[in-house]
């Protein structure tokens, strides 16, 4: 699997999850988030050569098409597969509010 | 929606579904498929600027991060959203076999 366990331990040029730390205030301008100050959102990048973690029949077909037609511009793209939530703390007035934001952290990637 | 209705009618540079005809024999080497000879598989391409058909909270966050950090290499990618099946006819010996192949045709795209 193209997950953090594999990708963070290997120098992988092809599609893989990459570490990306996002600071809420500096990177997004979200000054209202109290905790955490930032988090590892991660992101997916790298080429999708033929058959690398193909997501659907279409991506398998497209990968094969691309292999047999190297001049083609149509190729699968490396995108998130498994995402995890992130819990944040912010204030509504003086009242603390804890909220779980879904799909905030990329744990693995796929070629789609 | 970034679907065939919209994308095929407009000269859209950003993420959209693009027409791609695949000939089973010539493009994939699948000589055994009897009908159809080929089909419009289509594909997704084009930049994913901030908030364009963002798929998840992560792609929204990444799009915003990218907008505020233009030098960043982390950005969402244009990939299939809705896929449709394709029915093919082939022969097992001289017995015709009709099979529905899932996720073969891209109907719309998203930024993921």
């Amino acid at each position: 699997a193209l997950d953090t366990n594999y990708c963070f331990r290997n120098l992988e040029e092809n599609c893989c999850v990459r570490p990306l730390y996002i600071d809420f205030r500096q990177d997004l301008g979200w000054k209202w988030v109290h905790e955490p100050k930032g988090y590892y959102a991660n992101f997916c990048s790298g080429p999708c050569p033929y058959l690398r973690s193909a997501d659907t029949t279409h991506s398998t077909v497209l990968g094969l098409y691309n292999t047999l037609n190297p001049e083609a511009s149509a190729s699968p793209c490396c995108v998130p597969q498994d995402l995890e939530p992130l819990t944040i703390l912010y204030y509504v007035g003086r009242t603390p509010k804890v909220e779980q934001l879904s799909n905030m952290v990329v744990k693995s990637c796929k070629c789609s | 929606a970034l679907d065939t209705n919209y994308c095929f009618r407009n000269l859209e540079e950003n993420c959209c579904v693009r027409p791609l005809y695949i000939d089973f024999r010539q493009d994939l080497g699948w000589k055994w498929v009897h009908e159809p000879k080929g089909y419009y598989a289509n594909f997704c391409s084009g930049p994913c600027p901030y908030l364009r058909s963002a798929d998840t909270t992560h792609s929204t966050v990444l799009g915003l991060y990218n907008t505020l950090n233009p030098e960043a290499s982390a950005s969402p990618c244009c990939v299939p959203q809705d896929l449709e099946p394709l029915t093919i006819l082939y022969y097992v010996g001289r017995t015709p076999k009709v099979e529905q192949l899932s996720n073969m045709v891209v109907k719309s795209c998203k930024c993921s």
Partner: antibody
């Protein structure tokens, strides 16, 4: 060059299952049907079924329907054949073999080295 | 199922001999202008090797002393001049009907 490399010999008890692998290299794995053929000791060849890796489409021989499952892992270009509820008459050498590509059922131009499966109590 | 009957089941021959093996299908294997009949060679402990496909087409790399002929239900594999490496078992196979079936084999032995 095209190569099909199969997993090693297996000894199984009656009623058990066996899963044989076949790793392909040297050609476009998703463009050809993969067949499985077996040969009991001193006997002829018997076709078990086939799979098309890109689509997962399968055709099984009637004798094996319900007892065999053929799968592939396209990321590693590997085909698998699992045979369940083994009996002593399943003792045979199991071969994977690539169809030549013109039809689903076809002649087979490249064969694995074979995997001996022995079923014995 | 289509039954494939090979004859003889075994034969003894010498190097240089012309050898003919026949295969009879229980029904015609002709369709769309092709004869869906193929021939293989198998040596002890080895996998089969494709020799002839679609009745008469020589597989790449197979010596030209091998040839195939026939149509409908009756087919022949001929080795024009038997060589030491040709002593093996030969199988015919049809793919006109599911399941794909093989003949029982013809063992070519040294006289």
């Amino acid at each position: 060059q095209v190569q099909l490399v199969q997993s090693g010999a297996e000894v199984k008890k009656p009623g058990a299952s066996v899963k044989v692998s076949c790793k392909a290299s040297g050609y476009t794995f998703t463009s050809y049907w993969m067949n499985w053929v077996r040969q009991a000791p001193g006997q002829g060849l018997e076709w078990m079924g086939q799979i098309f890796p890109a689509l997962g489409s399968t055709n099984y021989g009637e004798m094996f329907e319900g007892r065999v499952t053929m799968t592939t892992d396209t990321s590693t270009s590997t085909a698998y054949m699992e045979l369940r509820s083994l009996r002593s008459d399943d003792t045979a050498v199991y071969y994977c073999a690539r169809g030549i590509g013109n039809y689903a059922l076809d002649a087979m131009d490249y064969w694995g080295q074979g995997t001996l499966v022995t079923v014995s109590s | 199922d289509i039954q494939m009957t090979q004859s003889p089941s075994s034969l003894s021959a010498s190097v240089g001999d012309r050898v003919t093996i026949t295969c009879r299908a229980s029904e015609s294997v002709d369709w769309w202008g092709n004869s869906f009949m193929h021939w293989y060679q198998q040596k002890p402990g080895k996998a089969p090797k494709l020799l002839i496909y679609l009745a008469s087409n020589l597989e790449s790399g197979v010596p030209s002393r091998f040839s195939g002929s026939g149509s409908g239900t009756d087919f022949t594999l001929t080795i024009s001049s038997l060589q030491p490496e040709d002593f093996a078992t030969y199988y015919c196979q049809q793919n006109i009907e599911d399941p794909l079936t093989f003949g029982g084999g013809t063992k070519v032995e040294i006289k």
